[in-house]
Interface confidence: low
């Protein structure tokens, strides 16, 4: 696919932060602020948690996640998977796009230690028009939200 | 904002290097190397630690440090807060932009021990003519410089 | 250096991904997939770990690795070094252009635990025709490899 | 390959000092602690502790505080114990070990005898 | 102060299993490492981190940990293996490495 950026034309963007209603519990992606502070949207749509592409191209898309706790939840996995993946219509299944492991919250914590650790996610990607990228975090519980400038998910075209 | 890129036009970007100087005990930002080395300016200029914005758009801002230590010097907060802040003439406190909390340098690591971690920001922001962005880490003491490739800070125009 | 980006041309970008064959244990550069799955190559060309460059320019790079263990290798060092290194006809050696350390592996690490820790690198450089950019990870063995999505490497012109 | 080569063997009297060098190849010095034991004839090891040639930094077995002294020159990637008021008592093998985390390489030993 | 404790000696016939034990109360916590040392020379390293083997090392030789125990085992062991055998480990704060006292064992 040969690409080219047309000098009137507006290059796609967009930074989406993360807001209480972020967090669902549901086992979907993380939702994410569109309009309201840091957050905005050019040339991109939004739907239920996903940055949507209207024109398909090459984006770098890029994501990330405050995580914090004291020790860590009752049940919780040694590994937190951070990562962005794709929807598209062509294919009933989420492809993982980029992917972070970390274990901020093993037994060298002592089990009642505040603790913070960050992950950040960025690359390019080849993305269709009509295809959805959404970030998902597991084990949830462990991000940290405050005020967007932490937790935030963004896109754009190269 | 309807942004175009022009063809004709030179991108904005920069690239700006720890050096020596970067770490001033002064409560202030970082400072930054502008010429040396890897460091440059390209259509943005520098202002006591802050890149400042000639020409206003939507710009992908990022910023490294290298934290390290031999355990954790006295009276250090078991969180490291690592952060770009935008000045604007329009409001008299920083706002905060991208930022990162990080526990590196908890009861976990053993008391005379040398360790290292890394801390990487980057998203877009809308940033107007005559802003600035700086970055700022708390505790400064943690940030480890060396030859301006392990704590760094830039931006350019998307 | 004036760069202009011509509206008719494309910008260069790629994005490579970590397989198998990443780990030489030759002590040389990490490898890349260049074609399969989320690799591409577009006005960037590749040869032995390398990004070769064939349009100056102030290029983003960016490298994500996936590090993890049980345990830790015999002989590891205390510190992990992650970075991206450019090649250039005009000097014998490698030039460090943006670098990590990190110790996720020290003996704070309790016995016997799986551990996970991610590395990300980014930031803008300029490249001349010619040059090229290679990632290296000393102690490489505790680079973890899986489907391309948790290690990366790749670069766009900005 | 790796190789740890030791200085030789040094004859001392009661309250003098002895400093032992160790010199590192076949890796990066700065990337490993170098870490000190000895052990008596007959005896076990004792560990009296390590130094990051990196950074410099130290961390000495509370039994040998106030007289030890772990240093290291890069240039030469060379490690150094410096043991001071020697009593009869420390007469032993002094070995140099790399360790990141695990003491994987030994150096050959340095033999030192104090007596009057 | 933390100390880990092995028997003074182990004898064994030739081709026998030989069991040394290392006993230490932050075992659970902590990694165990046994060390082979021949008279005259440098001790070597012959598992690391409970029961990994370097590279080298015979395959009868073998670690495990359980709880408060260390074990190295010699699984047929051979008149060569005579030496004395060290356990350490490292101390609660991983700072400071700890030996044991060290096994004589006899293959006879």
């Known amino acids: 696919l040969i690409q080219e950026r047309r000098s009137h034309e507006v290059n796609p963007a967009a930074h989406l932060t993360g807001a209480n209603s972020s967090l669902t519990g549901s086992g979907g992606p993380l939702l994410w602020e569109t309009q309201l502070g840091l957050a905005f949207l050019r040339g991109l749509s939004y739907h239920d948690g996903a940055l949507v592409v209207t024109k398909a191209g090459y984006y770098y898309i890029y994501s990330k996640v405050q995580l914090g706790g004291v020790g860590c939840p009752l049940g919780l996995a040694s590994t937190i998977t951070h990562g962005l993946y794709k929807r598209t219509p062509r294919y009933p299944e989420e492809l993982e796009l980029l992917v972070s492991q970390q274990s901020p919250c093993g037994r060298a914590t002592s089990s009642s230690r505040v603790w913070w650790d960050s992950s950040f996610l960025g690359g390019v990607v080849h993305l269709e028009a009509g295809e959805e990228v959404v970030v998902r975090v597991l084990d949830e519980r462990l991000v940290r939200l405050r005020d967007g400038t932490r937790s935030y998910f963004g896109a754009f075209m190269v | 904002l309807i942004q175009e890129r022009r063809s004709h036009e030179v991108n904005p970007a920069a690239h700006l290097t720890g050096a020596n100087s970067s770490l001033t005990g002064s409560g202030g930002p970082l400072l930054w190397e502008t010429q040396l080395g890897l460091a440059f300016l390209r259509g943005l200029s520098y202002h006591d630690g802050a890149l400042v914005v000639t020409k206003a758009g939507y710009y992908y801002i990022y910023s490294k440090v290298q934290l390290g230590g031999v355990g954790c010097p006295l009276g250090l907060a078991s969180t490291i807060t690592h952060g770009l802040y935008k000045r604007t003439p329009r409001y008299p406190e920083e706002l905060e932009l991208l930022v990162s909390q990080q526990s590196p340098c908890g009861r976990a690591t053993s008391s005379s021990r040398v360790w290292w971690d890394s801390s990487f920001l980057g998203g877009v922001v809308h940033l107007e003519a005559g802003e600035e962005v700086v970055v700022r880490v708390l505790d400064e003491r943690l940030v480890r410089l060396r030859d301006g490739t392990r704590s760094y800070f830039g931006a350019f125009m998307v | 250096l004036i760069q202009e980006r011509r509206s008719h041309e494309v910008n260069p970008a790629a994005h490579l991904t970590g397989a198998n064959s990443s780990l030489t244990g030759s002590g040389g550069p990490l490898l890349w997939e260049t074609q399969l799955g989320l690799a591409f190559l577009r006005g960037l060309s590749y040869h032995d770990g390398a990004l070769v460059v064939t349009k100056a320019g102030y290029y983003y790079i960016y490298s994500k690795v996936q590090l993890g263990g049980v345990g830790c290798p015999l002989g590891l060092a205390s510190t992990i070094t992650h970075g991206l290194y450019k090649r250039t006809p005009r000097y014998p050696e490698e030039l460090e252009l943006l670098v990590s350390q990190q110790s996720p592996c020290g003996r704070a690490t309790s016995s016997s635990r799986v551990w996970w820790d991610s590395s990300f690198l980014g930031g803008v450089v300029h490249l001349e025709a010619g040059e090229e950019v290679v990632v290296r990870v000393l102690d490489e063995r505790l680079v973890r490899l899986r489907d391309g999505t948790r290690s990366y490497f790749g670069a766009f012109m900005v | 390959q790796v190789l740890l080569v030791q200085s030789g063997a040094e004859v001392k009297k009661p309250g003098a000092s002895v400093k032992v060098s160790c010199k590192a190849s076949g890796y990066t010095f700065t990337h490993f602690d170098i870490n000190w034991v000895r052990q008596a004839t007959g005896q076990g090891l004792e560990w009296m502790g390590w130094m990051n040639p990196d950074s410099d930094n130290t961390d000495y077995a509370q039994e040998f505080q106030g007289r030890v002294t772990m240093t290291r020159d890069t240039s030469i990637s060379t490690a150094y114990m410096e043991l001071s008021s020697l009593r009869s008592e420390d007469t032993a093998v002094y070995y140099c070990?790399?360790?990141?985390?695990?003491?994987?390489?030994w150096g050959q030993g340095t033999l030192v005898t104090v007596s009057s | 102060s933390y100390e880990l404790t092995q028997p003074p000696s182990v004898s064994v016939s030739p081709g026998q299993t030989a069991r040394i034990t290392c006993s230490g109360d932050?075992?659970?916590?902590?990694?165990a490492y046994w060390y082979q040392q021949k008279s005259g020379q440098a001790p070597v390293l012959v598992i690391y981190?409970?029961?990994k083997r370097p590279s080298g090392i015979p395959e009868r030789f073998s670690g495990s940990s359980s709880g408060t125990m260390a074990t190295l085992t010699i699984s047929g062991a051979q008149v060569e293996d005579e030496a004395d055998y060290y356990c350490?480990?490292?101390?609660?704060?991983?700072?400071?490495?700890?030996f044991g006292g060290g096994t004589k064992l006899t293959v006879l």
């Open positions: 350490y480990s490292t101390d609660s704060s991983d700072n400071h490495v700890i």
């Open positions: 981190e409970d029961s």
């Open positions: 070990a790399r360790g990141g985390t695990t003491l994987d390489y």
């Open positions: 932050a075992l659970p916590k902590k990694y």
